[in-house]
Amino acid sequence: QTSVSPSKVILPRGGSVLVTCSTSCDQPKLLGIETPLPKKELLLPGNNRKVYELSNVQEDSQPMCYSNCPDGQSTAKTFLTVYWTPERVELAPLPSWQPVGKNLTLRCQVEGGAPRANLTVVLLRGEKELKREPAVGEPAEVTTTVLVRRDHHGANFSCRTELDLRPQGLELFENTSAPYQLQTFVLPATPPQLVSPRVLEVDTQGTVVCSLDGLFPVSEAQVHLALGDQRLNPTVTYGNDSFSAKASVSVTAEDEGTQRLTCAVILGNQSQETLQTVTIYSFPAPNVILTKPEVSEGTEVTVKCEAHPRAKVTLNGVPAQPLGPRAQLLLKATPEDNGRSFSCSATLEVAGQLIHKNQTRELRVLYGPRLDERDCPGNWTWPENSQQTPMCQAWGNPLPELKCLKDGTFPLPIGESVTVTRDLEGTYLCRARSTQGEVTREVTVNVLSPRYE
């Protein structure tokens, strides 16, 4: 009678086990073990027992002890069950961002692991079990569907295998996949709102604002603003579920023409974009040209207005004839023209908008000096001892220097309040002098004595 100990063994894959083969007779002709496993006979005194070390046990095996005794041959089997945790436990790759409301299929694949009868696959959200199934097939596959909710944002999904060998006196062996962190998002179907100037002048700055409501999580939204190839650097302000991105845009002569302004909002694996055209234009102010900005009275003056080739100008309110970018007028300079403004207004149509530019030049007319009766009366009669202010205004450009002297020495205090005395009486020679020449005018002051009764 052959016996084997232990009769049943559960051992880790690649492990070793000691198996003792015994026989009931004292002097067996043969006592051994039959197995494809690497084996070593170990030290055990006596003839009716042998102990073997079976090593590198990779799969379930049934070594067989045999003995040959005088009463015949017999055998006994030991059952080796190999256990090993799965070599691969992983969730099928998924995009980390998932839109709210979508059905998400979680698929867990399990390669290896034994004994399969003790192996269970569990799909989890955090620590909450979503599905539990025995491992079947190679690789074993367990799937479940999850309706993506807003509150799933940041949740970790994982797959766990449980090799439960507690009934065999061992432990529960757990293997967990790398977690899949779900990022949920809501990107509305409406494109972002883009507010910007439709036209923008070269060498100026404009402000562009892009905004969108109904986003989740708004802090994860990426905003890209660009004008043509120029990437703008916006300042983004976030609300609860909205953002507003504000950027300054500077344009140069190189940008002239029609440019695409884009605002793209990227959230998760989706994007919304708004396109707008901005026309970049160059429109210098019109040029007002005077033959000479300073002329003497009586000189003929030409005033020209020149603007952008596509502009239409008016000079001092008079449209160019024919309507176009140039206008001019001729005049003979009079004192009244001194300080006269010549204003040129140019209008350019850019992308359906009328752009206005003005330029003004002032004409200086040199004339005079002039002393006339209106501004410098030739005769004053004042009561003695009265308070009077002698007034005499000389005209001219440049403004003349005025002196009124009696007998070449006694000055008449022009523009000053004086008490009329006899000394004030007489004829004064008023002389107005400037770079344009000089004029004189006699002014007589009469003093009335008071009548004594």
Partner: antibody, heavy 121, light 108 residues
Framework: QVQLVESGGGLVQPGGSLRLSCAAS????????INWVRQAPGKGLEWVST????????FYADSVKGRFTISRDNSKNTLYLQMNSLRAEDTAVYYC??????????????WGQGTLVTVSS | DIELTQPPSVSVAPGQTARISCSGD??????VHWYQQKPGQAPVLVIY???KRPSGIPERFSGSNSGNTATLTISGTQAEDEADYYC??????????FGGGTKLTVLG
């Protein structure tokens, strides 16, 4: 540290008796099988005897069977070899050696320094 | 009964590899252990269970066992390795068996 110290060796006449002792320290003596191994002058190692951890099983080489008795006192952490009917060919250095904890593998991981037994008239 | 046979001596130049054989019937089916013994000292276990090295034994010592022959290999032999080397196995009766021993001489 783990140590085995043999004693009791000496000169004895053929046919005489001698008792060797081996004092163990530094390990749980009652968990291990212990062996006696001898080495005749200028010769190789020869296994003499083995005793199980509890003393219930003893094993001998054919050359000493019936003449030598191995025993142990686990309370004193001491191994003994009672040698009777000594012969000239028993002259050797006697070592006590500890078999590894799992005696099935049959190797000796700790050895004493040895004690010399000389059988001569 | 198993009988273990070793060459009486092996010589090796320093730094070279020394191989000491131990042969016996179906020796590969049992475990073989190796001991080093220097003059006047007790034996020291250098290899057990065919190829395992006890702690404190240099990595240059290795072992193998298959068929009828077990081999102790000392790579990069050093002068301090000069000693007697014994292989050991077991049988039912007698219980433990030693080889006759090999004297390793490191030349130079």
């Amino acid at each position: 540290q783990v140590q085995l110290v043999e004693s009791g060796g000496g000169l004895v006449q053929p046919g005489g008796s001698l008792r060797l002792s081996c004092a163990a320290s530094g390990f749980t003596f009652n968990s291990y099988y212990i062996n006696w191994v001898r080495q005749a002058p200028g010769k190789g190692l020869e296994w003499v005897s083995t005793i199980s951890s509890d003393g219930s099983n003893t094993f001998y080489a054919d050359s000493v069977k019936g003449r030598f008795t191995i025993s142990r006192d686990n309370s004193k952490n001491t191994l003994y070899l009672q040698m009777n009917s000594l012969r000239a060919e028993d002259t050797a250095v006697y070592y006590c050696a500890r078999t590894t904890l799992n005696y099935y593998y049959g190797y000796m991981d700790v050895w004493g320094q040895g004690t010399l037994v000389t059988v001569s008239s | 009964d198993i009988e273990l046979t070793q060459p009486p001596s092996v010589s090796v130049a320093p730094g070279q590899t020394a191989r000491i054989s131990c042969s016996g019937d179906s020796l590969g089916s049992k475990y073989v252990h190796w001991y080093q013994q220097k003059p006047g000292q007790a034996p020291v276990l250098v290899i057990y269970s065919d190829k395992k090295r006890p702690s404190g034994i240099p990595e240059r010592f290795s072992g193998s066992n298959s068929g009828n022959t077990a081999t102790l290999t000392i790579s990069g032999t050093q002068a301090e390795d000069e000693a007697d080397y014994y292989c050991q196995s077991y049988d039912s009766n007698p219980m433990l068996v030693f080889g006759g021993g090999t004297k390793l001489t490191v030349l130079g």
